[in-house]
Interface confidence: medium
């Protein structure tokens, strides 16, 4: 069974996947299909880097372009540096412009 078939088999379990498990899978030669990726919790996807999403999706990463206006892809794009998004070569727009300071508001809230 290949990586894609795994995700067809287990996509019903993935809705509650925590970020840590998604990061682990990104290191383990898996190709998640876009339909499954779109079902993930937005708060679990947001902390993933461009490189991690690229490795998690494998050849399916090209499908991000078709989903760039939909959650969780839209919200994830807004959290990435535009430079990093450009490395995918998909024409994704809406990332943080070069030179802008990125504030981790979740950390700020935790400290206040």
């Amino acid at each position: 069974m290949n990586g894609s078939e795994y995700f067809v088999k287990i996509q019903s379990f993935l809705g509650g996947a925590p970020t840590e498990d998604l990061k682990a899978l990104s290191q383990q030669n898996v190709s998640m299909d876009l339909a499954t990726f779109m079902k993930l919790r937005t708060d679990a996807v947001l902390p993933l880097t461009v490189a991690e999403v690229q490795k998690l999706l494998g050849p399916h990463v090209e499908g991000l372009k078709a989903e760039e206006r939909h959650r969780p892809v839209r919200d994830w794009i807004l959290r990435q540096r535009q430079d990093d998004l450009d490395t995918l070569g998909l024409g994704l727009q809406g990332g943080i412009p070069n030179g802008y300071l990125v504030l981790d508001l979740s950390m700020q809230e935790a400290l206040s």
């Epitope: 069974m1 990586g3 795994y6 995700f7 088999k9 287990i10 379990f13 993935l14 996947a17 498990d21 990061k23 682990a24 899978l25 290191q27 383990q28 030669n29 898996v30 902390p47 880097t49 490189a51 991690e52 490795k55």
Partner: antibody, heavy 116, light 111 residues
């Protein structure tokens, strides 16, 4: 082609220190977790340490047997991972391998001997 | 820690026969449905070489004589048919939880 060049092994006395280095090529080093694994006739293959990515603040994890004595680090600009080993014991003797991700690629290994 | 118990410790087979190696985990090694058990082959003087990842996926370049099966806690590496070149020690690895752990190894000899 993925390649690793490990160095730093040798003979050291109990209580001594040693630093191992592993220089990688052939893949985007900064995107992958890196591990050190060791092998001895007594213990077989034993995972030693792991370092994650810059986006994870270079989080590190260690086997219980080396916690507080070993320190893993990486330099993404040099595609290198290191293992600083202090207060070495006889049971640390073995072949030390660096490996990428979940073991898709391994170095040839460098031998550490801890003996008086 | 997750303990991986491999059996048998060694086996000797004639060329053309089927080799079956078991790896049993002390708890589930599934990450949201993906079984993160990997099989390695190690020949004398060489580092381990990845054969199978995620319990059943054949690594690129590995002959189709090698296959993996199982889920959750019970996994099997099968070599069918065995060839002279398969003389080695075979290990399983779990990457589900820190510390990552290896099985004790199975030595395959050819009669």
């Amino acid at each position: 082609e993925v390649k690793f060049e490990e160095s730093g092994g040798g003979l050291v006395q109990p209580g001594g220190s040693m630093k191992l280095s592993c220089v990688a090529s052939g893949f985007t080093f900064s995107n992958y977790w890196m591990n050190w694994v060791r092998q001895s006739p007594e213990k077989g293959l034993e995972w030693v340490a792991q370092i994650r990515l810059k986006s994870d603040n270079y989080a590190t994890h260690y086997a219980e047997s080396v916690k507080g004595r070993f320190s893993i680090s990486r330099d993404d600009s040099k595609s290198s991972v290191y293992l600083q080993m202090n207060n070495l014991r006889a049971e640390d003797t073995g072949i030390y391998y660096c490996s990428v991700g979940t073991g898709g690629y391994w170095g040839q290994g460098t031998t550490l001997t801890v003996s008086s | 820690d997750i303990v991986l118990t491999q059996s048998p410790a060694s086996l000797a087979l004639s060329p053309g026969k089927r080799a079956t190696i078991s790896c049993r985990a002390s708890e589930s090694v599934s990450i949201i449905g993906t079984d993160v058990i990997h099989w390695f082959q190690q020949k004398p003087g060489q580092p381990p070489k990845l054969l199978i990842y995620h319990a059943s996926n054949l690594e690129t370049g590995v002959p189709a004589r090698f296959s993996g099966s199982g889920s959750r806690t019970d996994f099997t590496l099968t070599i069918d048919p065995v060839e002279e070149d398969d003389v080695a020690i075979y290990y399983c690895l779990q990457s589900r939880k820190i510390p990552w752990t290896f099985g004790g190894g199975t030595k395959l000899e050819i009669k």
